[in-house]
């Protein structure tokens, strides 16, 4: 699996989408997990509704939500109030029994917040609200991991 990078801004919401073949994964619940180290286990964060037919209902665990469009074949994860500690490698998974298939590997990058000071100059996003109260834009910029980029930089 290639790794897809999703970039969000600290304090804002980030939407991660994981497309899949709706026929191949028919009847399967989905999950969002966090990779613990490069070869470590993937720790479950949140999973879709226990009843597959209700997978469209948004389920929360803390600041993370999951919802599944089972007909369209898109799993959507929302990370609310993004913080630096949310940065890291995750997986979208399709569950069957005790097994899990990886739908997508996701690297979440948390960027500095251009709204964290007023004198931001060219930091402003065009067309975005200029107050915290009105700012509900969910930035979700994704790309593939570039050559030379490391999803797990060594910790010092």
């Amino acid at each position: 699996h290639n790794t897809t990078v999703f970039q969000g801004v600290a304090g804002q919401s980030l939407q991660v989408s994981c497309p899949y073949d709706s026929m191949k994964h028919w009847g399967r619940r989905k999950a969002w997990c966090r990779q613990l180290g490069e070869k470590g286990p993937c720790q479950r964060v949140v999973s879709t509704h226990n009843l597959w037919l209700l997978s469209f209902l948004r389920r929360w665990n803390g600041s993370t939500a999951i919802t599944d469009d089972t007909l369209g074949g898109t799993l959507t994860i929302t990370l609310r109030n993004l913080q630096p500690h949310d940065a890291g490698l995750y997986q979208c998974q399709s569950l069957h029994g005790s097994e899990a298939d990886t739908l997508r590997k996701v690297l979440v990058e948390v960027l500095a917040d251009p709204l964290d000071h007023r004198d931001a100059g060219d930091l402003w996003f065009p067309g975005e609200s200029e107050s915290f109260e009105d700012a509900h834009v969910e930035h979700s910029i994704s790309r593939s991991l570039l050559e030379g980029e490391i999803p797990f930089p060594p910790t010092s």
């Epitope: 970039q7 801004v9 600290a10 304090g11 993004l82 913080q83 630096p84 940065a87 990058e109 948390v110 960027l111 500095a112 917040d113 251009p114 964290d116 000071h117 007023r118 004198d119 931001a120 100059g121 060219d122 930091l123 402003w124 996003f125 915290f132 930035h139 910029i141 570039l146 980029e149 490391i150 930089p153």
Partner: antibody, heavy 118, light 110 residues
Framework: DVQLQESGPGLVKPSQSLSLTCTVT?????????WNWIRQFPGNKLEWMGY???????IYNPSLKSRISITRDTSKNHFFLQLISVTTEDTATYYC???????????WGQGTLVTVSA | WMTQNPLSLPVSLGDQASISCRSS???????????LHWYLQKPGQSPKLLIY???NRFSGVPDRFSGSGSGTDFTLKISRVEAEDLGVYFC?????????FGSGTKLEIK
């Protein structure tokens, strides 16, 4: 011109709390910018610890998240660092600095050395 | 995670000096800007901002200092080293919400 000055005890015992004050003159901390704590370990390594912005919102380094708190006193134009359960690994020179997104850390205090030792 | 090279750079006064800084992640913000900055710390002093956003000299910084690079690879050049330039140079990024610094490069007399 804006000036920042750190103050606080130079010696802290292991397992106790480290508390520092940054006094800002020449600019109101509620007007703009994000007000940071950065530390420098012996051997020169710099570590960003976190900030409190003009509106009072805080962002912390995940490696310190469970131990750090940054607060402020707007009436005195001070902001504070509290680091709990310190060990000898927290011995460092602690700086306060102002972050402007475009310029990085354009203004720094002179730094205060904190030694953690029994 | 920022890697600086070399850790120590012995130079003769008047020489050109070049310091490299490499990031493990792209430093291009989603707004298109690259928040990579350079600082100089002289002995007994706090770091001072030299270059902001890759290549812009901060006020009062002599034009012998220049910055370049993009993405993950950046360079600070000093065209003719003077005695007052000696000290430790740090790169730093404020693109990602976890702000980080390079390990530092000590510029010293050969």
């Amino acid at each position: 011109d804006v000036q920042l000055q750190e103050s606080g005890p130079g010696l802290v015992k292991p397992s106790q709390s480290l508390s520092l004050t940054c006094t800002v003159t020449g600019y109101s901390i509620t007007s703009d910018y994000a007000w940071n704590w950065i530390r420098q370990f012996p051997g020169n390594k710099l570590e960003w610890m976190g900030y409190i912005n003009y509106s009072g919102r805080t962002i912390y380094n995940p490696s310190l998240k469970s131990r750090i708190s940054i607060t402020r006193d707007t009436s005195k134009n001070h902001f504070f660092l509290q680091l709990i359960s310190v060990t000898t690994e927290d011995t460092a020179t602690y700086y306060c600095a102002r972050w402007n997104g475009n310029y990085g850390f354009a203004y720094w205090g002179q730094g205060t050395l904190v030694t953690v030792s029994a | 995670w920022m890697t600086q090279n070399p850790l120590s750079l012995p130079v003769s006064l008047g020489d050109q000096a070049s310091i490299s800084c490499r990031s493990s992640q792209s430093l291009v913000h989603i707004n298109g800007n690259t928040y990579l900055h350079w600082y100089l710390q002289k002995p007994g002093q706090s770091p001072k901002l030299l270059i902001y956003k890759v290549s812009n000299r901060f006020s009062g910084v002599p034009d012998r200092f220049s910055g370049s690079g993009s993405g993950t690879d950046f360079t600070l050049k000093i065209s003719r080293v003077e005695a007052e330039d000696l000290g430790v140079y740090f790169c730093s990024q404020t693109t990602h919400a976890l702000f980080t610094f390079g390990s530092g490069t000590k510029l010293e007399i050969k």
